[in-house]
């Protein structure tokens, strides 16, 4: 049994890091493998992650971590029984994939303005809380070409757009994702999408 593709990990910079790797053949990850991880810090304890299958030869493990900060570095040991298959390290702050925003809501009752709001996925005491920026994707269910991205580079988790910038009388969907420049993160996954019917009063023409 050998590792074909070494583990690569990403952290949500809060409580979970996800590591994925591939074996050289079909593997029952949960029964044959264990990923041990330990913070390089005084008094830290070793933890064991039981991987799940991710395709025939692929494995994925969700590592639970407390109080993740930029100074943290973890040792990783991948074991098959008594055999050490791979040894490495992982610094969560250098491989951050933020959590997806939640609670995306479209408020349509504000005088021909659409107000989209969502929730920051981090608590206020997490460093990323004040450093997320967002991308909002709006698209028409009827017209695949009617697809747009709005970049929200301010901290407030909201976006206002004129309803008239979208077609009236049809349904739209929106979703939002986040990233943080400070840690050069990847984009988060998209939030679940929300749907609304866009209707507004056309301006009266003389």
């Amino acid at each position: 049994m050998k590792v074909l593709q070494e583990p690569t990990c990403v952290s949500d910079y809060m409580s979970i890091s996800t590591c994925e790797w591939k074996m050289n053949g079909p593997t029952n990850c949960s029964t044959e493998l264990r990923l041990l991880y330990q913070l390089v810090f005084l008094l830290s304890e070793a933890h064991t992650c039981i991987p799940e299958n991710n395709g025939g030869a692929g494995c994925v493990c969700h590592l639970l971590m407390d109080d993740v900060v930029s100074a943290d570095n973890y040792t990783l040991d991948l074991w098959a029984g008594q055999q050490l298959l791979w040894k490495g390290s992982f610094k969560p702050s250098e491989h951050v994939k933020p959590r997806a925003p939640g609670n995306l809501t479209v408020h349509t009752n504000v005088s021909d303005t659409l107000l989209l709001t969502w929730s920051n996925p981090y608590p206020p005491d997490n460093y990323l809380y004040n450093h997320l920026t967002y991308a909002v994707n709006i698209w028409s269910e009827n017209d695949p070409a009617d697809f747009r991205i709005y970049n929200v580079t301010y901290l407030e988790p909201s976006l206002r757009i004129a309803a008239s910038t979208l077609k009236s009388g049809i349904s739209y969907r929106a979703r939002v994702r986040a990233w943080a420049q400070c840690y050069n993160t990847t984009w988060s996954e998209w939030s679940p999408s929300t749907k609304w019917h866009n209707s507004y009063r056309e301006p009266f023409e003389q």
Partner: antibody, heavy 116, light 111 residues
Framework: QVQLVQSGAEVKKPGASVKVSCKAS????????MHWARQAPGQGLEWMGI????????SYAQKFQGRVTMTRDTSTSTVYMELSSLRSEDTAVYYC?????????WGKGTLVTVSS | QSVLTQPPSVSAAPGQKVTISCSGG????????VSWYQQLPGTAPKLLIY???KRPSGIPDRFSGSKSGTSATLAITGLQTGDEADYYC????????????FGTGTKLTVL
């Protein structure tokens, strides 16, 4: 919000022991290390040791080895610092502080006076 | 005796900028992360800067930190009378076993 509530001031005789408590609330107690530091009157901060509330393991500054004991009670989210063989130079304010590489939150401090 | 050396005192007028230095060595600041703590008179220390230059939420951007080699600096701009306090740098000594260190402390007086 996070709170670290420490026990009240103590007056002790030289040679005695003192046990200071620090009750934590507002966060997952076993997820954060707890440090103890002290500050003698008009002096700077001095680190004493650290406890991992999850397993109860400890590490102490060399200066206090053999005299200090840090424990925790997960049922009450409380950590304790006991200092024995007290001498006059142990008169100080003793602080508990939550954190790992740096100390996010501090208790208000407990004044321990050692006097004959 | 702390191996992190700070000036005993600094002073400046309201609105001015002041810097506080923290000098260490390769086994501490040079190989670890620096934090800064503010201790107002009669109160417990409060985290001001961590990870060399990051501010916890609620700390105004008048406070900033930097690190270069084996030294670190805390800068305070737009000084206010409420900033009058003792300031301590902190880091880890990477000897075995590792242990945290505090600086000697600096008393800031706002004239």
């Amino acid at each position: 919000q996070v709170q670290l509530v420490q026990s009240g001031a103590e007056v002790k005789k030289p040679g005695a022991s003192v046990k200071v408590s620090c009750k934590a609330s507002g966060y997952a107690f076993t997820s954060y290390y707890m440090h103890w530091a002290r500050q003698a009157p008009g002096q700077g901060l001095e680190w004493m040791g650290i406890i991992n509330p999850s397993g109860g393991s400890t590490s102490y500054a060399q200066k206090f080895q053999g005299r200090v004991t840090m424990t925790r009670d997960t049922s009450t989210s409380t950590v304790y610092m006991e200092l024995s063989s007290l001498r006059s130079e142990d008169t100080a304010v003793y602080y508990c502080a939550r954190g790992k590489w740096w100390l996010y939150n501090w208790g208000k401090g407990t004044l321990v006076t050692v006097s004959s | 005796q702390s191996v992190l050396t700070q000036p005993p005192s600094v002073s400046a007028a309201p609105g001015q900028k002041v810097t506080i230095s923290c000098s260490g060595g390769s086994s501490n600041i040079g190989n670890s992360y620096v934090s800064w703590y503010q201790q107002l008179p009669g109160t417990a220390p409060k985290l001001l800067i961590y990870d060399n230059n990051k501010r916890p939420s609620g700390i105004p951007d008048r406070f900033s930190g930097s690190k270069s080699g084996t030294s670190a600096t805390l800068a305070i701009t737009g000084l206010q009378t409420g900033d009058e306090a003792d300031y301590y740098c902190g880091t880890w000594d990477t000897s075995q076993p590792p242990n945290p260190l505090f600086g000697t402390g600096t008393k800031l007086t706002v004239l």
